[in-house]
Interface confidence: low
């Protein structure tokens, strides 16, 4: 279960980072970014990578620039691998990042948080069903 627990901790940390960035939303470049929503079952990892690839940037205004850049860097760190993530079901072709609706930073972060919460829920649900993840 160690790998699973490490994965869960990381996902929860990501939610904290997203929440932190939401506090500085006025200091982010007001660019529209692909923001997956209502992600299809088994396309969660694909959508997750779209959020990570998005060019979220600090507007370089004021004292918050450093903390924003550190948080964005943390968001882009690769999470611990899991069976589910490694074997995204190859029978599905997931939507490309560009096909998702583009949203400003505030909505982008809200949707990212929503996806992370869904992934945590499904991960826990799989655990209670006795999945052997590592």
């Amino acid at each position: 279960m160690q790998g699973q627990d490490r994965h869960m901790i990381r996902m929860r940390q990501l939610i904290d980072i997203v929440d932190q960035l939401k506090n500085y939303v006025n200091d982010l470049v007001p660019e529209f970014l692909p923001a997956p929503e209502d992600v299809e079952t088994n396309c969660e990892w694909s959508a997750f990578s779209c959020f990570q690839k998005a060019q979220l940037k600090s507007a370089n205004t004021g004292n918050n620039e450093r903390i924003i850049n550190v948080s964005i860097k943390k968001l882009k760190r690769k999470p611990p691998s899991t069976n589910a993530g490694r074997r995204q079901k190859h029978r599905l072709t997931c939507p490309s990042c560009d096909s998702y609706e583009k949203k400003p930073p505030k909505e982008f972060l809200e949707r990212f948080k929503s996806l992370l919460q869904k992934m945590i829920h499904q991960h826990l649900s799989s655990r209670t069903h006795g999945s052997e993840d590592s």
Epitope: D38, V39, E40, T41, N42, E44, W45, T82, N83, A84, G85, R87, Q88, K89, H90, R91, L92, P95, K118, M119, H121, Q122, H123, S125, S126, H129, S131, E132
Partner: antibody
């Protein structure tokens, strides 16, 4: 308690139509792919159709393609199977089945089944 | 479509026996396979997912193994309640397909 309850089965004449429903409870329905699986009397299991969480991907067995339509209403926690141009060989118990999410392979929750009989 | 061939089709065994059922896929399906148990008049029940992961609540006498094209379901010590029909199912590609079933009967 996680539960799937099918309804809508019955006796229908060849060429007729029937709509099966499946009411889901005890889990977040909108997060899971759902399937219909059938079993003819004394025979094995046959997968019929699949629909992903947001209805983005829909698949059918060759034996029912063009005649059956799967759909879902996440707001009502319901899955449906519209069956048209029914044939004698469609006679079976139809099960509503939840597919595991997030990259796991298996169908972990099954309804009790509803019986469809196609006969003149 | 990927074909799954189960063997044997039927099997007679006694309580306490070790029983192995095999499922062979017509092409490589990685570990995208599940095993189910079905009793007369009842819905199937999942035993094993991802080829070898035991479903929660399923007794540890059941185990699954294999990857690629050859898979096995093993019951280490048969209990009276294990007499039923067993099916394998592949999830590698659509259409999903089931094996034809293996009926396990009391000797």
């Amino acid at each position: 308690e996680v539960q799937l309850v099918e309804s809508g089965g019955g006796l229908v004449k060849p060429g007729g139509s029937l709509r099966l429903s499946c009411a889901a409870s005890g889990f977040i329905f909108s997060s899971y792919s759902m399937n219909w699986v059938r079993q003819a009397p004394g025979k094995g299991l046959e997968w019929v159709s699949s629909i992903t969480s947001g209805s983005y991907y829909i698949h059918y067995a060759d034996s029912v393609r063009g005649r059956f339509t799967i759909s879902r209403d996440n707001a009502k926690n319901s899955l449906y199977l519209q069956m048209n141009s029914l044939r004698a060989e469609d006679t079976a118990v139809y099960y509503c089945v939840r597919e595991r999410g997030w990259g796991y392979y298996g169908m972990d929750v099954w309804g009790q089944g509803t019986t469809v009989t196609v006969s003149s | 479509a990927i074909q799954l061939t189960q063997s044997p089709s039927s099997l007679s065994a006694s309580v306490g026996d070790r029983v192995t059922i095999t499922c062979r896929a017509s092409q490589d399906i990685d570990s995208a396979l599940a095993w189910y148990q079905q009793k007369p008049g009842k819905a199937p029940k999942i035993l094993i997912h991802d080829a070898s992961s035991l479903e929660s609540g399923v007794p540890s006498r059941f185990s699954g193994s294999g990857s690629g094209t050859d898979f096995t379901l093993t019951i280490s010590s048969l209990q009276p309640e294990d007499f039923a029909t067993y099916y394998c199912q592949q999830f590698n590609s659509y259409p999903y397909t089931f094996g034809q079933g293996t009926k396990l009967e009391i000797k």
